[in-house]
């Protein structure tokens, strides 16, 4: 299913990197959140949960992420303008059932301000 | 008129097979999640199994290994193939569908908001 | 597995008054609950979704309300052919998908 644009603040930037919000249902236990640049994937992360409620959390493209209760945030550093491109947040629902896959993103916009590594 | 009819539900002898129909109409077949639910005579409901619109399947566990739910979307179709029946799988089977939706932050569920009539299926010997 | 319990097993109440059945879950499934309606001889009918949303067609007489495990069901004023069989059913902690034991209203 392909949501189209987040409804909302995706990109947070802060010192020459972005952090990429993807958020979720708070009801869901288990899933897999893949970052995607245009069609490739950049990252992924994924959350199950084992007996006993054990939670293990795998990445098969690692980057930096974070994982809230409602969230995955990744976060790209370095940027130049090669990073403007379309991203989105595709989510795997594993648990509850059934298993649905949802697309959100928007487009990454680089302005010289939030460049790494001005040259003065 | 949104329609589900089954069909297929006969008489059978105990560890015998059945295969049980469920033909949709004047809906998204395939943006449905569907399931079978059955209902012994003047007892309550029982849910049996469940298929997503990725073709993932469930089983409640008295079916488990027996039974085996499948769809064929280009024909609007959902199927329950029954394998071991005993005595205690007699009931009416209903195939119903419902519908989850996930945006962002929220997931939506439905509610089983659409159903068949029912086909009886009596496994004695 | 959810257990979903229902009381009373039956509601004996006549044309015109109020009826009020109940649905208790056995772990919090927020407002993932619904209520179904059965009469003698036909399919279920869905009645209210995430606990409180009227289905397509229901008449404004019928409401849902609670969350997490307590749920209730109200028909502001019975018609004749509001009796029946009631059920709750929840889907967010499955399989299996759970239906309660059910609520027979019936006319005094």
């Known amino acids: 299913e392909i949501n189209g644009s987040a409804n909302y603040e995706m990109f947070i930037f802060h010192n020459g990197g972005v952090q990429i919000l993807c958020k979720y249902p708070d009801i869901v236990q288990q899933f897999k959140m893949q970052l995607l640049k245009g069609g490739q994937i950049l990252c992924d992360l994924t959350k199950t949960k084992g007996s006993g409620n054990t939670v293990s959390i795998k990445s098969l493209k690692f980057c930096h992420s974070q994982l809230s209760n409602n969230s995955v945030s990744f976060f790209l550093y370095n940027l130049d303008h090669s990073h403007a491109n379309y991203y989105f947040c595709n989510l795997s629902i594993f648990d509850p059932p059934p298993f649905k896959v949802t697309l959100t993103g928007g487009y990454l916009h680089i302005y010289e301000s939030q460049l790494c590594c001005q040259l003065k | 008129e949104v329609r589900l009819v089954e069909s297929g539900g006969v008489l059978v002898q105990p560890g015998g097979s059945l295969r049980l129909s469920c033909a949709a109409s004047?809906?998204?077949?395939?943006?449905?999640?569907m399931h079978w639910v059955r209902q012994v005579t003047g007892k309550g409901l029982e849910w049996v199994s469940a298929?997503?619109?990725?073709?993932?399947?469930y089983y409640s566990d008295s079916v488990k290994g027996r039974f085996t739910i499948s769809r064929e979307d280009a024909r609007n179709s959902l199927y329950l193939q029954m394998n071991s029946l005993r005595a205690g799988d007699t009931a009416v089977y209903y195939c119903?569908?419902?519908?989850?939706?996930?945006?962002?932050?929220?997931?939506?569920?439905?509610?089983?908001?659409?159903w068949g009539q029912g086909t009886t299926v009596t496994v004695a010997s | 597995e959810v257990v979903l319990t229902q009381f009373p097993a039956t509601l004996s109440l006549s044309p015109g008054e109020r009826a009020t059945l109940s649905c208790r879950a056995s772990?919090?499934?927020?407002?993932?609950l619904a209520w179904f309606q059965q009469k003698p001889g036909q399919a279920p009918r869905l009645l209210i979704y995430?606990?409180?949303n009227r289905a397509t067609g229901i008449p404004a007489r019928f409401s849902g309300s609670g969350s997490g495990t307590d749920f209730t069901l109200t028909i502001s004023s019975l018609e004749p052919e509001d009796f029946a069989v009631y059920y709750c059913?929840?889907?967010?902690?499955?399989?299996?998908?759970?239906f309660g034991p059910g609520t027979r209203l019936e006319i005094k």
């Open positions: 119903t569908g419902d519908r989850t939706v996930v945006r962002g932050v929220n997931y939506y569920y439905y509610g089983m908001d659409v």
């Open positions: 004047e809906f998204i077949f395939n943006s449905y999640d």
């Open positions: 298929i997503g619109t990725a073709g993932d399947t």
């Open positions: 772990q919090n499934i927020r407002s993932y």
């Open positions: 995430g606990a409180s």
């Open positions: 059913q929840q889907r967010i902690s499955w399989p299996p998908i759970t």
